[in-house]
Interface confidence: low
């Protein structure tokens, strides 16, 4: 399938509004500190080559890879140097050396400012104004901040981006009508970067075959009926699709999820019965609609797996014969009657089996020593089980803000050497699968909850990874991806951890908390908390309790006083010298 | 294209040494973990040590710990294994495989054969 002109390839195939969008995509996502105006006036310069290769594929370059292409564009911005220091020395390789090493750049957490949402009018005046350029600067905007966003999934976001404004700038209230959607946009958006972000991490630190068992897992769940032959086929496309995004190739990724999303509206009769609605809708929203497809139901006549996998003479000839098919086809008959346990519980299971195989196919009765392989995954699947149950009572009890604040707490003392800003963004992240997961029916508790944390956890990995501070924090992120969470889990009090040393400065609180969001005060209020636990790593429940509710009551006092500052300077000093005191 | 070569097998006395290389091209080298992973005669893959995409952390099977020294150099685009006091168990082929331990060989592998 090899085409004279790639770029004229990928141009036809996706036509000019996809191709522009994921070029200027690509571009946000490599240079993530350009302003907008360079990475339009790049994505133009590249359009219009494209363009002339769609005219003439023997035009000059047109034969070009497109990373070289890219490339050669992305090097022309002058102030590479001064904005990028060291990565201006990619420029000087050669493909495919020059991509790996703009890939290896990508900063997952960049010096930028956060977004701030104009007023409503402001807004839908510039959306009216120019409506392409307002769309443009979405796509910018969210990629430069979230450089492993799934591309061709933003486009769908950007998509609805565009229906949110259109239907609400010419409402009655704007406003009430607006904002709402564009926080479920911003809340899913978040959510959606940080998913793709596991799947990127999956595929570059253990490697495709950690990708594919997840995919045939999830795969299997969700197409119960599907064969293993159909299951796979699934799997090695989405396999390429997701290695294409995750190594940059923004248009091939594009292309190929299409062609994925085609196969399946075609295939629906083998694959499940609930494709039907998803396969109406126009590209995008079918791409979207085919990921998030809700798992068909299960084949009624299922026999027991003990028959093949456990009462079989042939199971040690059946795994020496092809390890990995075998192991598939195991862990796709265990999540397709499992659509209650996490993918994460199903690939510790599919692993446990391999170990006994290893184990018991070189035994003298290999039969006799597995014959009880499948009571020692009991318990692997209580102890998430158990864990769900615990924290899901827990919030139950707590609320969501106690619920974050006892995480804080927990995940501190567990790993005190994170910085206190990834430490507070990861507790409220982790405590928000109780208001996601625990209202659910218990059957689907277990997959929500912990496939959930996978997400979050791989966020404190990426950014521990680019400042590294604590081998408990490597050890748990780089040994097993699928023992990741029981490997966090099991995490004691850091009994090697030095205290830090009490500063009252960042104790130190101004009458601007009064103005603050809600949100804004109790990340301010937990920023305290995790430095109080980082002073005391071995204060009680209690003792922190009484400090925090010395902290609300100060702050409350303060912010309804007519003198807020006086009321600060003179009460913040009491207030410390008291924690101080309860600590003690 | 993915390409993983590996190079530097051959036939040592027992307690001798070997220095295996592996040359990456085709993909984001110094964006990914990697692996080396063996095969010795009739048996399955057996994994021997990793090495994170900066090379500032190293991970080693209890087989080999002490003996083997896993390194990579990102400007070549090259992973190394320095194998030192070399013992009969270690005769298999060994590959160089994208990601952390359980990534997948994809190159011939090179022989490595420990005989007195």
């Known amino acids: 399938d090899t085409h004279k002109s790639e770029v004229a390839h990928r141009f036809k195939d996706l036509g000019e509004e996809h191709f522009k969008g994921l070029v200027l995509v690509a571009f946000s996502q490599y240079l993530q500190q350009c302003p907008f105006e360079e990475h339009v006036k790049l994505v133009n310069e590249v359009t219009e080559f494209a363009k002339t290769c769609v005219a003439d594929e023997s035009a000059e370059n047109c034969d070009k890879s497109l990373h070289t292409l890219f490339g050669d564009k992305l090097c022309t911005v002058a102030t590479l140097r001064e904005t990028y220091g060291e990565m201006a020395d990619c420029c000087a390789k050669q493909e495919p050396e020059r991509n790996e090493c703009f890939l290896q750049h990508k900063d997952d957490n960049p010096n930028l400012p956060p977004l701030v949402r104009p007023e409503v009018d402001v807004m839908c005046t510039a959306f009216h104004d120019n409506e392409a350029t307002f769309l443009k600067k979405y796509l910018y905007e969210v990629a430069r901040r979230h450089p492993y966003f799934y591309a061709p999934e933003l486009l769908f976001f950007a998509a609805r981006y565009k229906a949110a404004f259109a239907e609400c700038c010419q409402a009655a209230d704007k406003a009430a009508c607006l904002l709402p959607k564009l926080d479920e946009l911003r809340d899913e958006g978040k959510a959606s970067s940080a998913k793709q972000r596991l799947k990127c991490a999956s595929l570059q630190k253990f490697g495709d075959r950690a990708f594919k068992a997840w995919a045939v897992a999830r795969l299997s769940q969700k197409f119960p009926k599907a064969e293993f032959a159909e299951v796979s086929k699934l799997v090695t496309d989405l396999t390429k699709v997701h290695t294409e995004c995750c190594h940059g190739d923004l248009l091939e990724c594009a292309d190929d999820r299409a062609d994925l999303a085609k196969y399946m509206c075609e295939n629906q009769d083998s694959i499940s019965s609930k494709l039907k609605e998803c396969c109406d809708k126009p590209l995008l929203e079918k791409s979207h609609c085919l990921a998030e497809v809700e798992n068909d139901e299960m084949p009624a006549d299922l026999p027991s797996l003990a028959a093949d996998y456990v009462e079989s003479k042939d199971v040690c000839k059946n795994y020496a014969e092809a390890k990995d098919v075998f192991l598939g086809m195991f862990l796709y008959e265990y999540a397709r009657r499992h659509p209650d346990y996490s993918v994460m519980l199903l690939l510790r299971l599919a692993k446990a089996y391999e170990a006994t195989l290893e184990k018991c196919c070189a035994a003298a009765d290999p039969h006799e020593c597995y014959a009880k392989v499948f009571d020692e995954f009991q318990p692997l699947v209580e102890e998430p089980q158990n864990l769900v149950k615990q924290n899901c009572e827990l919030f139950e009890q707590l609320g969501e803000y106690k619920f974050q604040n006892a995480l804080l707490v927990r995940y501190t003392k567990k790993v005190p050497q994170v910085s206190t800003p990834t430490l507070v963004e990861v507790s409220r992240n982790l405590g928000k699968v109780g208001a996601k997961c625990c209202k659910l029916p218990e059957a689907k508790r277990m997959p929500c909850a912990e496939d959930y944390l996978s997400v979050v956890l791989n966020r404190l990995c990426v950014l521990h990874e680019k400042t590294p501070v604590s081998e408990k924090v490597t050890k748990c992120c780089t040994e097993s991806l699928v023992n990741r969470r029981p490997c966090f889990s099991a995490l004691e009090l850091d009994e090697a951890y030095v205290p830090k040393a009490f500063n009252a400065e960042t104790f130190t609180f101004h009458a601007d908390m009064c103005t603050l969001s809600e949100k804004e005060k109790q990340v301010k209020k937990q920023t305290a908390l995790v430095e109080l636990v980082k002073h005391k790593p071995k204060a009680t429940k209690e003792q922190l309790k009484g400090v925090m509710d010395n902290f609300a009551a100060f702050v409350e006092k303060c912010c309804k006083a007519d003198d807020k500052e006086a009321c600060f300077a003179e009460e913040g000093p009491k207030f410390v010298a008291a924690s101080q005191a309860a600590l003690a | 294209q993915v390409q993983l070569v590996e190079s530097g097998g051959g036939v040592v006395q027992p307690g001798g040494s070997l220095r295996l290389s592996c040359a990456a091209s085709?993909?984001?080298?110094?964006?990914?973990?990697m692996s080396w992973v063996r095969q010795a005669p009739g048996k399955g893959l057996e994994w021997v040590s990793s090495i994170n995409n900066g090379g500032s952390d190293t991970y080693y099977a209890d087989s080999v710990k002490g003996r083997f020294t896993i390194s990579r150099d990102n400007s070549k685009n090259t992973l190394y294994l320095q194998m030192n006091s070399l013992r009969a168990e270690d005769t298999a082929v060994y590959y160089c495989?994208?990601?952390?331990?359980?990534?997948?060989?994809s190159g011939q592998g090179t022989q490595v054969t420990v005989s007195s």
């Open positions: 495989a994208i990601g952390g331990p359980g990534a997948s060989p």
């Open positions: 085709g993909f984001a080298f110094r964006g990914f973990g």
